[in-house]
């Protein structure tokens, strides 16, 4: 979890509420879900390594236009110490597989709050 | 459906250990960290210690002094709470208790109990 | 450790009153903060979480309220079957720690 210190915030965060905040509003998405999340976009999926925050967001700044998740792009570009622009790709980007945009955060949500759990009993 | 049940009644003598399991089902086990608490006769809610069953991580009430040992074994879905050195204040009725930490929070679903006597 | 300090430690009441119940804690707990109702010889069951989001098939009359170190739990109109204990959890940071309790009596 030491690679959430770069969190974007007036003070200083711990890593694990920079986490939690993060978590919550994947949670809030997944919830208040009414109609396909993001028009049903598709984006790159990726691997839930240790670079992954930089490439959700590579993959997630790909969609323009959803308000459902500007939030999320907001939080994640805090957790990348580079600046990511629309149409970059990492090596962590499984490149010939696109899903949808609801199953990405799902898949993120879970992954994180594994993260979040390790974190919690280390 | 979610459900947590413990093992039975145990009768101990002063410097015995105890162990209390609790086997769950209705969910992933890995999922949801697992909490142990302790409620002495007509006294409040008092948490021991938890774990998460991933990875066997623990964390711990240091009013227990290191006396409290938790484990999770993901082969049978259950999780185990080892109290040693006994006293008689340790008589209670013990508790499990599980939950997702973001939806429910992490003491969701609780095991029915098991009531630990020390006596001599 | 962080302290959640429950007031009043018991209380009567008549069917159909409102119930307030508050907690305290030491420090900013983030809203982090569980309410249980416990009967006698019984399990704990949750009732809140998340200081106001009420467990699926708690009945609306339970509702819970507040931020940063002070938290409420209200019973709008209580129901004979509401007469029992509670208590509320922070679960912001380790060690969690519950409050002392609340014993709600028939007046």
């Known amino acids: 979890l030491t690679c959430l210190g770069g969190f974007a915030s007036p003070g200083p965060v711990p890593p694990s509420t920079a986490l939690r905040e993060l978590i919550e509003e994947l949670v809030n998405i997944t919830q208040n879900q009414k109609a396909p999340l993001c028009n049903g976009s598709m984006v790159w999926s990726i691997n839930l390594t240790a670079g992954m925050y930089c490439a959700a967001l590579e993959s997630l700044i790909n969609v323009s236009g959803c308000s459902a998740i500007e939030k999320t792009q907001r939080m994640l570009s805090g957790f990348c110490p580079h600046k990511v622009s629309a149409g970059q790709f990492s090596s962590l980007h499984v490149r010939d597989t696109k899903i949808e945009v609801a199953q990405f955060v799902k898949d993120l949500l879970l992954h994180l709050k594994k993260l979040f759990r390790e974190g919690q009993f280390n | 459906e979610v459900q947590l049940v413990q093992s039975g009644a145990e009768v101990k003598k002063p410097g015995a250990t105890v162990k209390i399991s609790c086997k769950v089902s209705?969910?992933?086990?890995?999922?949801?960290?697992m909490h142990w608490v302790q409620q002495a006769p007509g006294k409040g809610l008092e948490w021991m210690g938890g774990i998460d069953p991933e990875t066997g991580g623990t964390a711990s009430n240091q009013k227990f002094k290191g006396r409290v040992t938790i484990t999770a074994d993901k082969s049978t879905d259950t999780a185990y709470m080892e109290l040693s050195s006994l006293r008689s204040e340790d008589t209670a009725v013990y508790y499990c208790?599980?939950?997702?930490?973001f939806g429910g929070g992490p003491f969701a679903y609780w095991g029915q109990g098991t009531l630990v006597t020390v006596s001599s | 450790d962080i302290k959640m300090t429950q007031s009043p430690s018991s209380l009567s009441a008549s069917v159909g009153d409102r119930v307030t119940i508050t907690c305290k804690a030491s420090q900013d707990i983030n809203s982090y903060l569980s309410w249980f109702q416990q009967k006698p010889g019984k399990a704990p069951k949750t009732l809140i979480y998340?200081?106001?989001r009420l467990v699926d098939g708690v009945p609306s009359r339970f509702s819970g309220s507040g931020s940063g170190q002070d938290y409420t739990l209200t019973i709008s109109s209580l129901d004979p079957e509401d007469f029992a204990t509670y208590y509320c959890?922070?679960?912001?940071?380790?060690?969690?720690?519950f409050g002392g309790g609340t014993k709600v009596e028939i007046k």
């Open positions: 998340r200081a106001n």
């Open positions: 209705g969910y992933t086990f890995t999922d949801y960290e």
């Open positions: 959890l922070q679960y912001d940071e380790f060690p969690y720690t």
């Open positions: 208790a599980t939950g997702d930490y």
